[in-house]
């Protein structure tokens, strides 16, 4: 028949070519002479000339070694004619397949590999994966199947198999306990590619597995006892700076320190941070520290890390013994803001106060007095005692000086410290009101027609406060009462002035005297400008001139 | 000569607690990871639970996980197993062993849990 | 149901050989040489007769000797004793949080 079996041909054939494969036979050759000829890629297309037929005898033939990497299979077509160039069969299909021959090492896909495992992990833990190809067959045969093998590991530390890799996938594992990234940061491991499942070409590449930090090191004090000197009252003051060991990984979570004050500060005095770049603890005062009330404080300090440890590790505490230095402080004012009531207008030399100022410091020290600012300058103030005495009239209603019935004075002190301190203290002179003023009445200046007049409706005021203000009363003195009325309204705040009698024009005075409910009397003179007009008017109207 | 010795076993009813000890010598303990693996009575070896040297890294088998603490006290030489929520099925002999390289070296005698009402 | 496979007994006569199997996967047995095996007398703590397939401990008898293929490792016992009755188990390294796998153990009978 017409047909052929698929032929195997190893790759790498070492000759003599042309080399017979098979021989293509028509039964028609019993009546007629055939020639033969073969098509397709490896015959008369690319790669052409690999084979070729005998054209008489049908003989294939394979013309040089081939290359199952290359192509792996060959697909042709036979063909059969007389000689008169007539096909005598159908084209035939002839398959030519390429067998493999282990004739490819594998080759890694990188020369290096690059992993990272946690220290401290358990064995079976996953670390990278390794690959290496092979392009010879691994389907049909072992030729292309890979083993992969751990050849060695660098540094042998804690011991020489710390490792192992998955024979089939190439993936690393760790083996054994003891990564300590402290002791070990890197391993460098030759592995090993293996064809035929691990018996036959090798090759190697290297593996660094890189040791990845854990917080598995507490931060640990270096000095653990310091002593150190602080003056009283600094605030934000730098204390001391601690000093710390971390064998982690530097400027990690689990090297930088957190630093707690554990106890020692009762009155919540000090504070510590880290410095970013030292990794030390500043130690600084948050307040101003009293040398009088306690000259020591003995501090205790634990460290730990900004990453939580991931075993149970001991805290390093540090003693710090902070002396408290002494220092000239001033004297302060008690209370620092004095609030006096004293009534206004008493007596030159009269007494007002007594204000004084104790000293911080232990020692004894002799405190004098004097006034800082009297904007009136009506108070002294003895330097020895503090007594402050009247100098001048307290006037409530001096607007200038006085607000809100306030009159405010700021004293000094100062201690025979070497070098002096002064404090400053504020004495407010609340100032108890006495009726010394009478009522005024405004406006002081009327004008009113003298015929059909309108009343005139003045206000009252006092400087004073109640009760020495309203209600008040009006009397008309001097004869002013032959032509005018003055009464006081119900309220009693306002004054109604009333012409009477007829008067020509002509500008009078108005004699009225106004007394308080303390019958405090204040005389005013009203000058009243009398127009020849009726009812209401502002300003007389100027004599008539005819045109 | 290496050295383990459980103790902590006992009867215990279903839903209570036990924790188990395990004191080493002999050996670097800090460099050894261990491991609590149990035998049901007449049944074959089941392993529990691992911890690394450190104390850093643990394992647990699902049949626990959630009710059974691993942890390890490097400065007393000593492995603990925190069993909580004891069912009648944990009912075994434990035993601690430090694990090597690719297995279990050295072992403990055992001790017996007994989870019954 | 274990992760290694052993035979439930074996039984041989003394001074005659025996083998026990321990059928795991490509991704234990078959993928690191790292089998070992237990002998565990009746009320006593298993001990290490095996380790890295083929590798003895100090002090275990070289009558004890492993091999592997594939996805199979075998311990082999030679010149059978009346000691060596006991359970044994085969013992599989594997990547991951389960990185020991047991064998369900074999009880050896010295007939």
């Known amino acids: 028949d017409w047909v052929v079996a698929p032929i195997s041909v190893p790759e790498n054939g070492k000759g003599p070519f042309p080399q017979r494969l098979n021989q293509l036979k028509s039964n028609k050759d019993r009546d007629t002479k055939i020639f033969y000829s073969i098509t397709g890629p490896g015959a008369d297309s690319p790669p052409e000339g690999v084979f070729a037929v005998e054209k008489e005898t049908g003989w294939l033939l394979l013309n040089k070694p081939l290359d199952r990497e290359e192509i792996a299979k060959y697909e042709l077509f036979g063909h059969a004619v007389s000689e008169n160039g007539a096909s005598v069969e159908d084209p035939m299909n002839i398959s030519i397949i390429v067998t493999d021959q282990n004739d490819h090492k594998p080759k890694f896909t990188q020369d290096t590999f690059r992993g990272s495992v946690l220290e401290g992990v358990l064995p079976g833990t996953s670390v990278m994966q390794v690959t290496a190809t092979d392009e010879d067959d691994a389907i049909y045969t072992y030729n292309g199947v890979v083993a992969y093998s751990i050849h060695s590991q660098e540094p042998k530390d804690p011991h020489d198999l710390m490792f192992t890799i998955h024979r089939s996938t190439g993936t690393i594992s760790v083996i054994s306990s003891g990564l300590d990234r402290e002791k070990v940061p890197e391993y460098t491991l030759t592995i090993q590619a293996t064809d035929m499942d691990g018996d036959g070409s090798t090759t190697t590449a290297v593996a660094v597995v890189e040791i990845l930090d854990a917080n598995d090191n507490a931060p640990m004090f270096d000095p653990q006892k310091y002593e150190a000197h602080v003056p009283e009252n600094a605030v934000g003051h730098e204390v001391q700076r601690l000093t710390v060991t971390d064998l982690d990984a530097p400027n990690s979570p689990a090297w930088r320190a957190t630093y707690l004050i554990m106890g020692g500060d009762d009155g919540d005095h000090f504070t510590i941070t880290t410095h970013p770049e030292s990794n030390q603890g500043i130690l600084t005062t948050r307040k101003g520290l009293d040398f009088e009330a306690k000259n020591q404080h003995t501090l205790y300090v634990e460290v730990t890390n900004e990453a939580p440890f991931v075993l149970k590790l001991p805290t390093s505490t540090a003693t710090i013994v902070v002396h408290v230095e002494d220092v000239n402080e001033a004297p302060v004012f008690v209370p620092p803001s004095k609030v006096v009531e004293v009534q206004e207008g008493i007596p030159t030399g009269e007494p007002v106060c007594v204000y004084t100022a104790e000293d911080p410091d232990k020692e004894n020290q002799k405190i004098s007095y004097r006034i800082l600012r009297d904007p009136a300058g009506w108070l002294a103030m003895d330097p020895d005692s503090g007594q402050v005495t009247a100098v001048g009239t307290l006037d409530r209603e001096d607007e200038q000086f006085v607000r809100n019935n306030i009159y405010e004075v700021m004293v000094l002190a100062m201690d025979n410290g070497s070098p002096p301190t002064t404090g400053t203290g504020t004495l407010l002179l609340t100032l108890i009101d006495v009726n010394d003023h009478g009522p005024v009445p405004e406006p002081r200046q009327i004008t009113i027609c003298n015929q059909s007049p309108v009343r005139q409706v003045l206000n009252i005021t006092d400087k004073d406060l109640s009760p020495h203000t309203s209600p008040f009363q009006a009397q008309l003195t001097d004869d002013s009462d032959i032509y005018w009325t003055a009464e006081v309204n119900e309220e009693g705040d306002t004054v109604v002035l009333s012409l009477k009698k007829f008067l020509k024009q002509d500008t009078y005075d108005v004699h009225l005297s106004l007394s308080d409910h303390g019958n405090k009397e204040q005389l005013t003179v009203i000058r009243a400008t009398v127009c020849d007009c009726h009812g209401h008017v502002e300003t007389c109207p100027g004599p008539w001139k005819g045109g | 000569e290496v050295q383990l010795l459980e103790s902590g076993g006992g009867l215990v009813q279903p839903g209570g607690s036990l924790r188990l000890s395990c004191a080493a010598s002999?050996?670097?303990?800090?460099?050894?990871?261990m491991s609590w693996v149990r035998q049901a009575p007449g049944k074959g070896l089941e392993w529990v639970s691992a911890?690394?040297?450190?104390?850093?890294?643990?394992y647990y088998a699902d049949s626990v996980k959630g009710r059974f603490t691993i942890s390890r006290d490097n400065s007393k030489n000593t492995l603990y197993l925190q069993m909580n929520s004891l069912r009648a099925e944990d009912t075994a002999v434990y035993y601690c062993?430090?694990?090597?390289?690719?297995?279990?070296?050295?072992w403990g005698q055992g001790t017996m849990v007994t989870v019954s009402s | 149901q274990s992760a290694l496979t052993q035979p439930a007994s074996v039984s041989g006569s003394p001074g005659q050989s025996i083998t026990i199997s321990c059928t795991g996967t490509s991704n234990d047995v078959g993928a690191y040489n790292y089998v070992s095996w237990y002998q565990q007398h009746p009320g006593k703590a298993p001990k290490l007769i095996l380790s890295e397939v083929n590798k003895r401990p100090s002090g275990v008898s070289n009558r004890f000797s492993g091999s592997k293929s594939g996805n199979t490792a075998s311990l082999s016992i030679s010149g059978l004793q009346a000691e060596d009755e006991a359970d044994y188990y085969c013992?599989?390294?594997?990547?991951?949080?389960?990185?020991?796998?047991f064998g369900g153990g074999t009880k050896l009978t010295v007939l």
């Open positions: 002999g050996f670097t303990f800090s460099s050894y990871a």
């Open positions: 062993a430090s694990w090597g390289t690719g297995q279990h070296e050295n």
């Open positions: 013992s599989s390294f594997t990547s991951g949080s389960t990185f020991n796998l």
């Open positions: 911890i690394s040297g450190s104390g850093g890294s643990t």
